[in-house]
C-alpha cells in the first residue's frame, strides 16, 4: 500500500470524567474521499481495536451505537473523543487512515498517543 | 444491517430507456460510493460506474459512457440508474453494490439485482 | 484495464475433496506489498458475495473451507474439505484500479 503521513499528539491527558480527545491529521496524497479511520490501543506489546468509522470527507464521522468513540472531521483532520476510560485503559492509542476508495488505496499509521487516566479519588464521606 | 433493496424487474422495448433505483438502509447513506454492475445471462461482471452520494459525483466505464446516467436522492437514501436506447444487448441482471471496511472491499453489499428484459 | 482470465470454466470435484481455481491477472495487482484481488461466490437468483479480498483474508462470516492465496498476477482460490453448498459460479476481481474487473467465472459442481 502506498504511504500516507498521519500526525497526531504525543501525550494527551484524560479528563476526571473519563474523556480524551486528540486530533489525528493525514496528509492526504490521492484523490480518494472515501476514508476509514481506526484507533488502535498498544498495552503491553498487545494491539487492540478500539473503534473504527468510515465517512466520506466533509461529513461527520459515524461509529457504532455502542462505540466508546465520536469524532468530528475537518478536511485532512479528525477529532477523536474517547469516553469511559479508566486507570486501567491508560496506553498508547494510534491512528490508522486508510483512505478506501477511489483507488488508490493509502494507509497512514499514527505514532500514537500516549493516554494517561487516572481514577478520580472517591469523596470521602461527609458528615453533613 | 446494511441492506440495498432494488427496484422490480423491467420489461422494455427497443429504443426505450429504463430507470430502476436502490434503496440503502443500515448506515449513513452519503459514507460510501455506490457501484453499479451488469450481468448478462450466464456470463461474468461488468463495472458501470460509481456515484458519490455526497455530492453527485460520477465516474463511469468507458463503455458505459453515453448509456448509463447515474443519480442519487440524499433525502430518500436511494440511489437510480437510467439507461437509454436499449437493444438486446442491454438485456441484464443490473446491480447496485457498497464497498465495505477491508482494503480492496469494493463490493462488500449487493443489492438483489433489477431483471432488464428488452425485447420487441 | 486489467484483464483476469479464470481457470478452468468448470469444475467437478468429489465431497469433502479440495477444489482449486486460479485466476491470472494481465498485469500485476500488487501496490506496495498488498494484493488487490478478491474473490466472489454467486449461486443461481442471487448477488455474489465476498468470500477473499486482498488475495488471503476472508470475508465476514465465511467459513474457514475457503482461503486464497497469490501475488502479483497468478492467485487461487481453495475450497477444503468440498460441500454440498458450494456448488456455484466462482469469479475473482481486481481492485487495485478502475474500472474493476471480474474474470469469466468458474462453475463448480459435486462430482
Known amino acids: 500500500c502506498k504511504a500516507m503521513h498521519v500526525a497526531q499528539p504525543a501525550v494527551v491527558l484524560a479528563s476526571s470524567r473519563g474523556i480524551a480527545s486528540f486530533v489525528c491529521e493525514y496528509a492526504s496524497p490521492g484523490k480518494a474521499t472515501e476514508v476509514r479511520v481506526t484507533v488502535l490501543r498498544q498495552a503491553d506489546s498487545q494491539v487492540t481495536e478500539v473503534c473504527a468509522a468510515t465517512y466520506m470527507m466533509g461529513n461527520e464521522l459515524t461509529f457504532l451505537d455502542d462505540s466508546i468513540c465520536t469524532g468530528t472531521s475537518s478536511g485532512n483532520q479528525v477529532n477523536l473523543t474517547i469516553q469511559g476510560l479508566r486507570a486501567m485503559d491508560t496506553g498508547l492509542y494510534i491512528c490508522k487512515v486508510e483512505l478506501m476508495y477511489p483507488p488508490p488505496y493509502y494507509l497512514g499509521i499514527g505514532n500514537g498517543t500516549q493516554i494517561y487516566v487516572i481514577d478520580p479519588e472517591p469523596c470521602p464521606d461527609s458528615d453533613f | 444491517e446494511v441492506q440495498l433493496q432494488q427496484s422490480g424487474p423491467e420489461l422494455v422495448k427497443p429504443g426505450a430507456s429504463v430507470k430502476m433505483s436502490c434503496k440503502a438502509s443500515g448506515y449513513t447513506f452519503t459514507d460510501y460510493y455506490m457501484k453499479w454492475m451488469k450481468q448478462s445471462h450466464g456470463k461474468s461482471l461488468e463495472w458501470i460506474g460509481h456515484i458519490n452520494p455526497n455530492n453527485g459525483d460520477t465516474f463511469y466505464n468507458q463503455k458505459f459512457t453515453g448509456k448509463a446516467t447515474l443519480t442519487v436522492d440524499k433525502s430518500s437514501s436511494t440511489a437510480s440508474m437510467h439507461l437509454n436506447s436499449l437493444t438486446s444487448e442491454d438485456s441484464a441482471v443490473y446491480y447496485c453494490?457498497?464497498?465495505?471496511?477491508?482494503?480492496?472491499?469494493?463490493?462488500?453489499?449487493w443489492g438483489q439485482g433489477t431483471l432488464v428484459t428488452v425485447s420487441s | 484495464d486489467i484483464v483476469l482470465t479464470q481457470s478452468p470454466a468448470s469444475l467437478a470435484e468429489f465431497l469433502g475433496q479440495r477444489a482449486t481455481i486460479s485466476c491470472r491477472a494481465s498485469?500485476?495487482?500488487?501496490?506496495?506489498?498488498?494484493?488487490?484481488m478478491n474473490w466472489f461466490q454467486q449461486k443461481p437468483g442471487q448477488p455474489p458475495k465476498l468470500l477473499i479480498y486482498a488475495a488471503s483474508n476472508q470475508g465476514s462470516g465465511v467459513p474457514a473451507r475457503f482461503s486464497g492465496s497469490g501475488s502479483g498476477t497468478d492467485f487461487s482460490l481453495n475450497i477444503h474439505p468440498m460441500e454440498e453448498d458450494d456448488t456455484a459460479m466462482y469469479f475473482c476481481q481486481q481492485s487495485k484500479e478502475v474500472p474493476p474487473t471480474f474474470g469469466g467465472g468458474t462453475k463448480l459442481e459435486i462430482k
Open positions: 498485469e500485476s495487482v500488487d501496490s506496495y506489498g498488498i494484493s488487490f
Open positions: 453494490a457498497r464497498g465495505g471496511d477491508g482494503r480492496g472491499t469494493w463490493f462488500a453489499y
